[in-house]
Each structure stands twice: as structure tokens, then as C-alpha cells.
């Protein structure tokens, strides 16, 4: 009975999400393997988040709006481990918008989800950021490593979206 009611709840939750995400990829987790954590297909998952790499070239604002329509934001990177996971799926000759911007050009960087900007947990390439006119951040491969660079927000780039996992 308990299992039956849990399955019914899951199915109704899945139906609820199906109007937003036609397909979900779920894995069982939790100490009794009773919880399912899901990401939209074909998003990838790491820890408690889902990630989507958009190869559509768009401005930073349009990229953020695009993520938002999918229930996500441009990616907020909190740890080196998270960045290392993300970069496994990136092309080394491309650049991707992050959810990091400095709209006034005052070098007051801010994350799209209001996570406090911590200078100690940043991965800027050497010499970056370097221009008050370049108010949006990308991640790209330079000098044999992945890092961040400030760029013009209006210049179209690829992007990375991030959302919380869906638990059912």
C-alpha cells in the first residue's frame, strides 16, 4: 500500500513536470534508494544540479532569457569540482556564457541567482577581467586550462544553463 501510494504520487508529479519537460532522466538515490532525482533529457547531472550546453550563439541577455524559459539560469559555478565537471562536455575552441555579469562596469560582479560573488572562488584567466566595457563572463580554454574571461555582453556566444534537480 505504501509503495503503491508512493508510485501514484510519483506518476502525478511526473505528469505535472511533463508539460515543461517532455522527457526526464531519473536515478534512484537516498539511503533507502527510495528517492528519484531527475534532470530533463538530454541535460547532464552533477551533485544536486542539472546542466544544459546551448550551442545557439546569442547575446548574454538572450542566453539568460533562454535558460529562464527552461526553468533554469545561466550557470553559477560554486566550486572547482563543479567547473571540472562542466568543462568535460565543452569544446576547447568555443566560449560559453556564465551567469556572471557586471552591468554597471564598476567591477561589481554578480551571479544571476544572487549567490554572493566570492573573489576567493573565482577562476579568471590570468590578467582577467580586464575591461570595464566587457561586462559579461564566459568560460573558455586558454593557456592549457579552462578559465573565465570578461567579454562584451552583446556579442553572441554559446552558453550553459543550470537548474536544480527535480526530486520525485
Amino acid at each position: 500500500n505504501f509503495m503503491y501510494s508512493k508510485t501514484v504520487k510519483r506518476l502525478s508529479k511526473l505528469q505535472e513536470y511533463q508539460q515543461y519537460y517532455p522527457s526526464l532522466t531519473c536515478v534512484m538515490e537516498g539511503k533507502d534508494m527510495e528517492d528519484w532525482s531527475c534532470c530533463p533529457t538530454p541535460w547532464t547531472s552533477f551533485q544536486s544540479s542539472c546542466y544544459f550546453i546551448s550551442t545557439v550563439m546569442q547575446s548574454w541577455t538572450k542566453s539568460q532569457n533562454n535558460c529562464s524559459v527552461m526553468g533554469a539560469d545561466l550557470v553559477v559555478i560554486n566550486t572547482k569540482e563543479e567547473q571540472d565537471f562542466i568543462t568535460q562536455n565543452l569544446k576547447i575552441n568555443s566560449a560559453y556564457f556564465l551567469g556572471l555579469s557586471d552591468p554597471k562596469g564598476w567591477r561589481h560582479w554578480q551571479w544571476v541567482d544572487q549567490t554572493p560573488y566570492n573573489k576567493n572562488v573565482t577562476f579568471w584567466h590570468s590578467g582577467e577581467p580586464n575591461s570595464p566595457d566587457e561586462r559579461c563572463a564566459i568560460i573558455n580554454f586558454r593557456s592549457e586550462e579552462w578559465g573565465w574571461n570578461d567579454v562584451h555582453c552583446h556579442v553572441p556566444q554559446k552558453s550553459i544553463c543550470k537548474m536544480k534537480k527535480i526530486y520525485i
Epitope: 546569442q58 547575446s59 541577455t61 532569457n65 555579469s101 552591468p103 575591461s131 561586462r135 555582453c153
Partner: antibody, heavy 121, light 111 residues
Framework: EVQLVESGGGLVKPGGSLRLSCAAS????????MSWVRQAPGKGLEWVAT????????YYPDSVKGRFTISRDNAKNSLYLQMNSLRAEDTAVYYC??????????????WGQGTTVTVSS | DIVLTQSPASLAVSPGQRATITCRAS??????????MHWYQQKPGQPPKLLIY???NLESGVPARFSGSGSETDFTLTINPVEAEDTANYYC?????????FGGGTKVEIK
């Protein structure tokens, strides 16, 4: 006082080349992105090329891509537009304009008086 | 590319009256309260001159009879009251995304 003075325009045959210059004064040229904007006779404004302050970024519309090259010499406070394989439809007044960034975009806050390019056989 | 459509293409206004020009973008040029639409005036034989930036901000030295409003895709430039010296072409321009694009222009004549 901010001043932008274009030169180098003239009459050229189709397929020919021309190099436009824009001399900037009255501001720290190296700190600003710059653009070329053109206006065909009796027509509206059409953006032609952009270069970032540090020369790291250039951008062109499809109509001139591969034919026009924007460049700058910050030591000389000068902006250039090299125009090759010119066509009749490139006939226009060419303005150089300074970009001022605002939030996620920019606007053109100062314009030169323009230089006229005529492409005709 | 973002297409900007200005209307009307031309208008004639009597001195002291109000002139209203609209600019419609093919997609939003706004983001979180910032509207990246700008307005320029071009008098015959002269280069364009910045009037309004970011939809509603009056450029320094521009008379207060010029004002701008709007958001997302619909923007308006208003001249009130119109003076004889306002005879010119007026252009809108967006900068939220490359390439920067201009509207086709509106010719304002004073009756």
C-alpha cells in the same frame, strides 16, 4: 571637446579599394570601442563595423564581411576602415562613431562629420 | 538580427504641438528593467546626434522638450512642444545584441 574627423573618401571604380581614417581628439581614445556607420544617399543609417577598445574584438555585417577591415592605432588616436572589392551599393557617407557602454549594451554618443565614398565606373 | 520598424515614415507638425514617433522591435530589447533602445536626430547635411539613451535618459545638452519612453518591443520619442529647429530625421537604434540595428527613420517637418 570630443572631436572625430574622417578622411579618405573619394571616387573609386567597382572592385577598387579605399582606406578611410578617423582622427580622434578630446578624449582617451584607447578606452572606447569605435564603429563605422554609413548612410547611402537619401537612405537611413547602416552599421558597418565595430572594434573594441583593446582591439580584441571586431564585428561586421554580412554585407561587408570579408571585404572591409576595421582597425585602430591607439598610439595615433586613429581609427581605420580598409574597404576592398568595392561595389556600387557601398556608395555612402561613412561616419565614425564613439561607443559608450550602458548596462549590457551601448550607444553612439559622438559622431564625426562623415566622408563620402562614391563607387562608380 | 533585430528589426526596428519606425512609424510614421514622416509627419508634419505645427509649432507648439506634440510630435510622437514610435519604434517597434522584432523582439525584446529590455532586460531586468534596462531598455537598450536609443534615439538620434539628424538634420540635413549633418551627422546624427544622440538625443535619448536607454529609452528615457536625456543626453546632456538636449532640450527637455524631447522625451522617450517604452519597454520590451515598443518605444516612443515625443517632442513637446515642437519648435521650428526640430525639422530633422529621427532614428531609433538597439544595442542589446549584435549587430546593432537602426530603424528606417522618421522625417519630421514643421508646418
Amino acid at each position: 571637446e570630443v572631436q572625430l574627423v574622417e578622411s579618405g573618401g573619394g571616387l573609386v571604380k567597382p572592385g577598387g579599394s579605399l582606406r578611410l581614417s578617423c582622427a580622434a581628439s578630446g578624449f582617451t581614445f584607447s578606452s572606447y570601442g569605435m564603429s563605422w556607420v554609413r548612410q547611402a544617399p537619401g537612405k537611413g543609417l547602416e552599421w558597418v563595423a565595430t572594434i573594441s577598445s583593446g582591439d580584441s574584438y571586431t564585428y561586421y555585417p554580412d554585407s561587408v564581411k570579408g571585404r572591409f577591415t576595421i582597425s585602430r592605432d591607439n598610439a595615433k588616436n586613429s581609427l581605420y576602415l580598409q574597404m576592398n572589392s568595392l561595389r556600387a551599393e557601398d556608395t555612402a557617407v561613412y561616419y565614425c562613431a564613439r561607443q559608450l557602454y550602458y548596462s549590457y549594451g551601448y550607444y553612439f554618443d559622438y559622431w564625426g562629420q562623415g566622408t563620402t565614398v562614391t563607387v562608380s565606373s | 538580427d533585430i528589426v526596428l520598424t519606425q512609424s510614421p515614415a514622416s509627419l508634419a507638425v505645427s509649432p507648439g504641438q506634440r510630435a510622437t514617433i514610435t519604434c517597434r522591435a522584432s523582439e525584446s530589447v529590455s532586460f531586468h528593467g534596462t531598455h537598450l533602445m536609443h534615439w538620434y536626430q539628424q538634420k540635413p547635411g549633418q551627422p546624427p546626434k544622440l538625443l535619448i539613451y536607454a529609452a528615457s535618459n536625456l543626453e546632456s545638452g538636449v532640450p527637455a522638450r524631447f522625451s522617450g519612453s517604452g519597454s520590451e518591443t515598443d518605444f516612443t520619442l515625443t517632442i513637446n512642444p515642437v519648435e521650428a529647429e526640430d525639422t530633422a530625421n529621427y532614428y531609433c537604434q538597439q544595442s542589446i545584441e549584435d549587430p546593432p540595428t537602426f530603424g528606417g527613420g522618421t522625417k519630421v517637418e514643421i508646418k
